[in-house]
Interface confidence: low
């Protein structure tokens, strides 16, 4: 067994006894008598461990010695202290001229701190003034043994430690012994030496171990509101460091024209809440904590915290809603230290519209409600960003009103999947809700591992995506790597003092929003023959579905006139149009689209042009004139041939040069190359000559042509 | 009590065509994505294709893409795998499945095709 | 795609004995999405876990799975004559869906 007497957050009796005596002459703490020990054999008080040490009266001794001992009735061994006196047995040696008639008493109280780095013992002297005039000194010894299984004796002469008490004020010292936190579960065994005017007091061994004799911080943070549903909500949050849960004891008043309640109570949860609340009060509140789950001391109180109700309470006192939503007020409302009856009171909106009593409900004597129902947006009134909601009187409205804030939430979130298929990008605009001061808006998201569900729904498990600010006003997200079939359901989070709102769910599968890449390979021709405007395109790598295409074609200039043409073959690679002017120059644009319908066009192609070439024949030679000039008696005669350029329309779409055809009946058939030229001069000699002029281009000669014949006579032709 | 029964299974030459189906009951089919998974003989699992609850959505493994096509009624609460020139390499029990993610919580007890010449 | 990779691919056991079977994927499976599966011969195959951790209703608790990014493992605590059978690991996360190459459990 070990020698040395327990130390508990429970009190124990130090008697200090004359040689010789019995148990029964032994001197119980005041108030307690020998029989009103607890279960387990030590002396019980319910606020707080005091370690009280009681000496006889010292009547008719000249020297005495006595023996201090802590004693409980199942425990008659005393522990003695071995010190530096050759390890003696202590004895308190009491000149009988100086303390003659005095009980010698101690009030000791032990604890760890909260911090959990000091043991703090606090000798406290009932001696009262009497040391005054004495050199009073308070020495606390102790010792952590290592393993003190292994050592039930008492530790030896020379392994105790001191450490000085300080006495500020000579009733009160202070003992520091400092505790590794490694050694806090350990035991450690002190014991206290008090010497004052020669004379030396010592108590016997005591044994502890500092983690069941914690005294915490106290509670830190203590605040009270007023709860949506009426009650006052006493909160706090425990002081940092304590290794385990604590207790805690609620000490509250409440003070007003009509009742004064005071309360006590014990609670785990670092809140309380205290009902049927009143108007015009005052609640004055205080709160102390202790271990939880085994020994421990309480900690000091609080400071105390007033908290002054309204004469008129409304809860909740403000209200963020969304479009289409109910919410309810309540009210208690007090007007000259009387109560108003629940029945008489009315409510108002903006102290312009009265709230029909439809809307109301007598939840108890003095608790009004009113309900708003499938709320519309709050539209605001000069700088106020809500409705204010008045609980009156029949007669008259206090200055003090309930907040409510409506919110159209309905915000369009758009997606749209790159043509690599690599990422996706949500774009989402504030701009048709009211904003609300002191807000943030927060795009959430929950990605399924397959599609959407039919209808969505906000999902308890999110992840905030960041989003950032464009020049547009627009705010825009971008999920990579993305999951195509995955279904992401997004919804925006208005996050605000009073609550938080979101914007109805929206679920997006990238597979379903893509906007392909362009078509590429773009090319435009006019078809040498056939005459169309052939239009090639290849289609996007991604996405693998098929895709429908939109061609957009027009005469190259400054402002084109589109013309549409749409194919639906998800195989086709080109397509031939019939267009107007052959000879012109063609822009040409091709964008695609998944057939189904689903996601985005692509952006247009880069325009394709095509080029002015011959595509056929010319249509025609040209119109020409002649002039003939000779005279008219020779047989010989000049003749001039004239004519116009053909034109684009005729040449299909160019003529490289004209060629002239002759013919006689002697002669024959020959053919002139006069190039490009448009006037050609020959000589008639023959009594019949045709000519014929033919346009030739990179394709041919011209099929439809126009014939001159020239016989005699003839005169000059203007 | 879930329930996907299946049917159309059968030996098939090479080239030809065949189509399973694959009745489904005890729960909200209108609500599920449906799978077709199939098993060569002695071999492991192979996903097929699958169709979204309401069939907007229909992928298809790229072993069968293009011959293959998944369908769905579900006025009559029955999926379907149209399969078109087949290979004997298409050989296999194959199942539909029910998920609601993408694992696959309810199985049809599986139909052999045997695509032989 | 993402190619799963079980092991061992034959694991002998006897009837009380602890069976951890592993699945290796070649890249992340992103949140998890990771399903176990147990085939008998001639039947259909069963959904033991998904979420790479989560049981169904009516699957036994002796059937637990962990892991996360490209390890998983199934395990099962003590082996019961009735837990001879193949097991699949498949992957959801990803298009294509893809399952591993199986673990077949024989009795030593």
């Known amino acids: 067994f070990n020698l040395s007497y327990p130390i508990t957050p429970w009190r124990f009796k130090l008697s200090c006894m004359p040689p010789n005596s019995t148990y029964d002459y032994f001197l119980l703490p005041a108030g307690l008598s020998k029989n009103t020990s607890n279960s387990n054999g030590h002396y019980e008080t319910a606020v707080e461990p005091k370690f009280n040490s009681s000496g006889t009266h010292f009547s008719n001794l000249s020297k005495t010695t006595f023996h201090c001992c802590f004693r409980s009735e199942q425990d008659r061994n005393c522990s003695l202290c071995a010190d530096n006196i050759e390890g003696k047995t202590f004895v308190s040696t009491v000149n009988s001229l100086v303390f003659q008639q005095i009980d010698a008493n101690w009030n000791i109280q032990c604890w760890l701190k909260g911090d959990l780095k000091l043991f703090i013992c606090y000798v406290e002297s009932l001696f009262k003034n009497l040391f005054r005039n004495y050199n009073y000194k308070v020495h606390l010894l102790y010792v952590l043994p290592e393993v003190l299984e292994d050592s039930p004796l008492v530790p030896q002469k020379g392994s105790f430690q001191m450490v000085h008490c300080n006495c500020s004020v000579h009733e009160c010292c202070e003992c520091l012994v400092p505790v590794p936190t490694a050694k806090l579960n350990d035991t450690l065994l002190m014991c206290l030496k008090i010497t004052s005017g020669g004379v030396i007091f010592q108590s016997p061994l005591m044994s502890v171990q500092p983690i069941n004799m914690v005294k915490p911080d106290p509670p830190l943070g203590l605040h009270m509101e007023i709860t949506d549903d009426g009650n006052l909500k006493i909160s706090w949050s425990s002081p940092p460091l304590v290794p385990f849960p604590l207790q805690y004891q609620v000490k509250y008043s409440e003070n007003s024209t009509t009742v004064i309640r005071e309360a006590d109570k014990i609670v785990s949860a670092t809140s309380l809440l205290v009902d049927s609340i009143l108007p015009g009060s005052s609640y004055e509140v205080q709160v102390r904590g202790k271990r939880l789950d085994g020994p421990g001391i309480w900690s000091d109180w609080s400071t105390p915290r007033v908290f002054t109700t309204q004469d008129v309470i409304y809860f909740p006192p403000k209200i963020l809603t969304s479009v289409g939503s109910n919410v309810s007020f309540h009210c208690i409302y007090k007007k000259e230290n009387k109560i108003v009856p629940s029945k008489e009171i009315v409510w108002w909106m903006n102290l312009a519209e009265k709230i029909p009593q439809s809307q109301y409900d007598v939840v108890s004597d003095h608790v009004s409600k009113v309900t708003f129902f499938n709320l519309n947006e709050t539209k605001p009134r000069g700088k106020f960003t809500y409705d204010a909601v008045y609980c009156c009187n029949e007669h008259e409205c206090h200055h003090r009103y309930a907040e409510l804030y409506v919110i159209d939430v309905n915000i369009n979130i758009s997606c749209e999947t790159d043509g690599y298929l690599t990422k996706m990008t949500c774009r989402w605009s504030t701009s048709t809700i009211q904003s609300l001061a002191e807000s943030t808006l927060q795009l959430r998201y929950h990605r399924s591992s397959l599609y959407c569900s039919d209808i969505p729904s906000i999902h308890p498990i999110s992840e905030p995506k960041d989003c950032y600010l464009q020049s547009d006003g627009f705010y825009e997200c971008i999920f990579q790597p993305i999951f195509l079939l995955s279904g992401y359901t997004m919804w925006i989070r208005i996050n605000h003092s009073l609550g938080s709102l979101d914007s109805p769910p929206t679920c997006v599968l990238p597979d379903s929003v893509v906007k392909p890449l362009p078509p590429s390979s773009v090319k435009a021709e006019i078809t040498i023959n056939i005459g169309l405007l052939k239009i090639s395109w290849e289609k996007p790598v991604f996405p693998e579905n098929n895709l429908q295409f939109q061609i957009r074609y027009g005469l190259s200039g400054k402002e084109v006139q589109w013309k549409m043409y749409e194919v639906y073959d998800a195989k086709s690679k080109s397509v031939s149009l019939p267009v107007p002017d052959l000879c012109a120059v063609y822009a040409v644009q091709v964008r695609c689209k998944r057939l189904d319908g689903l996601g985005y066009w692509s952006n247009w192609s880069n325009p394709a042009y095509t080029v002015v070439m011959d595509i056929k024949v010319p249509m025609r030679g040209p119109e020409f004139w002649r002039i003939i000039n000779g005279d008219t008696m020779k047989k010989e005669k000049n003749v001039t041939l004239l004519w116009k350029p053909l034109m684009k329309n005729d040449s299909l779409c160019s003529v490289q040069r004209y060629v002239i055809n002759h013919h006689t009946s002697c002669n024959g058939t020959w053919s002139e190359d006069v190039g490009n030229h448009t006037k050609f001069t020959f000589l008639w000699t023959e009594q019949a000559h045709t000519v014929t002029v033919l346009a030739i281009n990179s394709i041919g000669a011209s099929v439809a042509n126009f014939n001159l014949t020239f016989s005699w006579p003839m005169s000059k032709v203007n | 009590q879930v329930q996907l029964l299946q049917s159309g299974g059968g030996v098939v030459q090479p080239g030809r065509s065949l189509r399973l189906s694959c009745a489904a009951s005890g729960f909200t089919f209108s609500s599920y994505g449906m799978h077709w998974v199939r098993q060569a003989p002695g071999k492991g699992l192979e996903w097929v294709a699958v169709i979204s609850y309401d069939g907007s959505n229909k992928y298809y493994a790229d072993s069968v893409k293009g011959r293959f096509t998944i369908s769905r009624d579900n006025s009559k609460n029955t999926l379907y795998l149209q399969m078109n020139s087949l290979r004997a390499e298409d050989t296999a029990v194959y199942y539909c499945a029910g998920v609601r993610e993408n694992y696959f919580s309810y199985w049809g007890q599986g139909t052999l095709v045997t695509v032989s010449s | 795609e993402i190619v799963l990779t079980q092991s061992p691919g034959t694991l002998s056991l006897s009837p009380g004995e602890r069976a951890t079977l592993s699945c290796r994927a070649s890249?992340?499976?992103?949140?998890?999405?990771l399903a176990w599966y147990q085939q008998k011969p001639g039947q259909a195959p069963r959904l033991l876990i998904y979420g790479a951790s989560s049981r169904p209703t009516g699957i036994p608790d002796r059937f637990s799975g962990s892991g996360s990014g490209t390890d998983f493992t199934l395990t099962i605590s003590r082996l019961e004559p009735e837990d001879f059978a193949v097991y699949y690991c498949?992957?959801?996360?990803?298009?294509?869906?893809?399952f591993g190459g199986g673990t077949k459990l024989e009795i030593k």
């Open positions: 890249q992340s499976v992103s949140s998890n999405y």
């Open positions: 498949q992957q959801y996360a990803a298009s294509p869906l893809t």
